[in-house]
């Protein structure tokens, strides 16, 4: 049978030929009749065999980290017969380890994030070094970790490479630390090889700072002309934390007048003071409010850092603005009777300067030839008024400060012209009537109506009569219909075109005004030559009108 011990060859041997061991057949009596052969990967290139003795040699430097074992085949042949003395057999050559590899941190770079103020013992990160040497060969790959840089804040567990916090850290003082870890093989014994790595440890923020106003007093100004919603200034608190932990909310703690509000600009973390109600310099020219600030997000366990909110005082000065005159009323309505003489009193408007200096006011009327206004605001007429021409006047009255003519206010003034009974009633139209020669008595010649340009206080009522002369001539008569109309009727039978071709009737129309006014209106009546049926060529139009006539008893 085959005889051999386990074969080992140390790595990194520099000799040209290193004796690994010997394999032989127990049938070999040493008379050089046997030939030994080596087969397989590495045979002849990495390992050779002395064909006579079976001694095996490594002929090149080996690297255990590259390859730690070789499986070769051995043959032994009897030279005299050419036959195999033993069956072909496999054997293993192991490459034994030397400590020729330092520990390496293959997962570099290392970076860790840990919350500030983390308690002692908090795990930060684990670093792991690899040693290419054989872990089963002594202590060549047994590592010990130590801290070269990072005390007193960090520590490393010697056998695991776990980095822990050993002292609380405040991000606001220092937000990152470089820790240097060394790994030594041979468990740190003499002759050990080492490798180092750097670990960047960043502290993440916790909300351990409340926002604080740097200024205890802010002075702001607001114009009295500023509309509600106007931003009148900003206030700013500072929080040493970052990100969400530095987000803050501003609010008003004291504002008796409830005139101001504070909103938060979450992008700039500023507080914006807003005008909630309009201010009036003449009413109140300064305000004092107190604002407070607190973080937007506060965890329950961090409330101890946020017990009392920071506050600041804000003094707000109201700036006076030269305001235009202010009329007592938004508009005025005055009344005046028509036909009153020029210079008649219409009414008084009044405006004042709302500012403290109380400038005198001058008044004017825009584009009016009918009215005048004096410096006291008294409006008078410049002409007699006729309601029947204009019943209303829309005036624009302007008040101007004497000391600043740019300060102007205008208001509308409405003047109603009141009616007096200064117009008698008259025909509502021109009447021209016709009567046939053969007309009978009581025949309706014309229906008349009247109009009055005066305004009716209640309702117009007109009274119709013939003049005294016409009443006496008695060719025609009039009947008042009591509805502001009247009818003219014939008062005789038969008319003569040749003798009296035209009649002029004077009709008196009186109104019910006080005093009553009467007008005389002339009605022209033409006599026509009519046939028996009451129609004639020259009276065709009249025929139609007369055919509608009626007789009265």
């Amino acid at each position: 049978g085959w005889v051999w011990n386990q074969f080992f060859v140390p790595e990194e041997m520099n000799t040209t030929s290193h004796h690994v061991g010997r394999l032989r057949s127990d049938l070999d009596n040493g008379n050089n009749s046997f030939q030994y052969k080596l087969l397989g990967a590495g045979a002849g290139s990495t390992f050779i065999i002395d064909e006579r003795t079976g001694d095996i040699y490594a002929i090149e430097k080996l690297d255990r980290e590259e390859r730690s074992l070789y499986i070769l085949r051995a043959q032994v042949i009897d030279i005299t017969t050419g036959r195999a003395v033993e069956p072909e057999s496999e054997f293993v050559i192991k490459v034994s380890d030397i400590n020729d590899n330092e520990p390496k941190f293959l997962d570099e770079p290392y970076e860790a994030i840990v919350p500030e103020m983390s308690p002692e013992g908090t795990l930060v990160i684990q670093v792991t070094a690899s040693d290419a040497d054989d872990p089963s060969s002594g202590n060549n790959a047994r590592l010990l970790y130590s801290l070269l840089q990072g005390q007193p804040y960090f520590s490393v567990e010697p056998t695991t490479g776990v980095i822990r916090i050993s002292s609380k850290m405040d991000r606001e003082l220092q937000d990152e630390y470089w820790v240097i870890i060394q790994a030594k093989d041979m468990i740190g014994q003499p002759g050990a090889l080492s490798g180092t790595t750097s670990v960047l440890i960043k502290l993440s923020d916790v909300n351990d700072n409340k926002p604080i106003f740097k200024e205890s007093l802010y002075r702001l100004t607001v114009s009295e002309s500023a509309p509600t919603g106007t931003s009148i200034g900003t206030i700013m608190a500072y929080d040493n934390d970052i990100g969400e932990n530095a987000e803050m909310d501003y609010s008003i703690e004291e504002d008796d007048s409830q005139t101001f509000d504070i909103i938060t600009n979450h992008e700039t973390q500023e507080g914006i003071v807003i005008l909630k109600k309009k201010v009036n310099f003449e009413h109140q020219n300064h305000y004092g409010i107190r604002a407070k600030v607190k973080n937007h997000h506060v965890d329950e366990q961090l409330m101890k850092y946020h017990t009392e909110a920071s506050t600041t005082f804000i003094k707000i000065q109201v700036e006076d603005v030269d305001e235009p005159p202010l009329f007592l009323l938004p508009y005025y309505i005055f009344e005046i009777f028509e036909e009153t003489p020029q210079g008649s009193f219409v009414g008084v408007v009044s405006a004042t300067d709302p500012d403290n200096r109380k400038s005198p006011i001058r008044y004017s009327i825009t584009r009016s030839k009918v009215f005048n206004i004096d410096d006291n605001g008294t409006i008078t007429t410049t002409n007699s008024l006729d309601r029947e021409i204009s019943a209303w006047y829309n005036l624009s009255i302007t008040a101007t400060e004497k000391y600043n003519i740019e300060q102007i206010s205008s208001i509308p003034v409405y003047v109603q012209v009141l009616n007096i009974n200064d117009h008698a009633p008259e025909f509502s139209q021109y009447y021209e009537s016709y009567v046939c020669e053969n007309a009978g008595s009581g025949q309706v010649i014309q229906t008349i109506s009247a109009v009055d340009r005066d305004e009716s206080i209640e309702e117009h009522h007109f009274y119709f009569n013939l003049s005294v002369e016409d009443t006496n001539s008695s060719s025609f008569t009039i009947i008042d219909n009591q509805d502001n109309t009247a009818v003219i009727l014939t008062n005789r039978t038969g008319f003569n075109l040749q003798e009296e071709p035209i009649f002029y009737i004077s009709i008196l129309i009186a109104d019910n005004g006080i005093p009553s006014l009467t007008s005389t209106n002339t009605l022209t009546i033409h006599v026509c030559d009519c046939d028996d049926s009451g129609s004639t060529q020259t009276c065709q139009y009249q025929e139609l009108m007369l055919s509608m006539g009626f007789k009265t008893e």
Epitope: L39, G40, S45, D63, E66, R67, L69, I71, A132
Partner: antibody, heavy 120, light 108 residues
């Protein structure tokens, strides 16, 4: 787990040099016990080992290609590369990179392969 | 160099059947140095067996390997539809490292 990815031009002109790179992810190329290998497969044919390299730079080549092959390693980039010079149409193949167990010689894992065509 | 010959070149079987694939070496190869791979169309080879008989990680137990010296066998005890592919053997016992020509396992 370790993954490999081949990259390089898909078309090379005859007589020029074919250059491919294999990028290793999920593990360091600098770990002992492994070779980093190139294998090729002609269209519709079997597999042919080209050669391999240890991360420290030692190389082993198939004698049939040795005169034209160079394999190199860049540990800083976790990459190894193949250069095959004086290519002909016979070098048209799918080229794979793979990790080889240095003690027992099996290939695992493999890249997905890249087809290189040699044509003018 | 060691030449690996695989037979049959093509094997036609049905799902559920047993498949036996052979690999013969031109010289003796240590069983530690023989591996089997599976390759599907358009994919890279996948390691099935190493050391002649050890299953690689994630390989179902219907795959088994055996053999020594010059004759090695890959057995698939009960074929699944996904097992139809090309199978290669590979040796590391002598330089250059070589692959067999492959056996195509197809659905009957």
């Amino acid at each position: 787990q370790v993954q490999l990815q081949e990259s390089g031009p898909g078309l090379v002109k005859p007589s020029q040099t074919l250059s491919l790179t294999c990028t290793v992810s999920g593990g360091s190329i600098s770990r002992g016990g492994y070779y980093w290998s190139w294998i090729r497969q002609h269209p519709g044919k079997g597999l042919e080992w080209i050669g391999y390299i240890f991360y420290r730079g030692r190389t082993y080549y198939n004698p049939s290609l040795k005169s034209r092959v160079t394999i190199s390693v860049d540990t800083s980039k976790n990459q190894f590369s193949l250069k095959l010079s004086s290519v002909t149409a016979a070098d048209t193949a799918v080229y794979y990179c793979a990790r080889v167990n240095s003690n027992y010689g099996w290939f695992d894992p493999w890249g997905q392969g890249t087809l290189v065509t040699v044509s003018s | 160099e060691i030449v690996l010959t695989q037979f049959p070149g093509t094997l036609s079987l049905s799902p559920g059947e047993r498949a036996t694939l052979s690999c013969r070496a031109s010289q003796s190869v240590s069983s530690s140095y023989l591996a089997w791979y599976q390759q599907k169309p358009g994919q890279a080879p996948r390691l099935l067996i190493y050391g002649a008989s050890s299953r690689a990680t994630g390989i179902p137990d219907r795959f088994s390997g055996s053999g020594s010296g010059t004759d090695f066998t890959l057995t698939i005890s009960r074929l699944e539809p996904e097992d139809f592919a090309v199978y290669y053997c590979q040796q590391y016992g002598s330089s250059p490292l070589t692959f067999g020509g492959g056996t195509k396992l197809e659905i009957k």
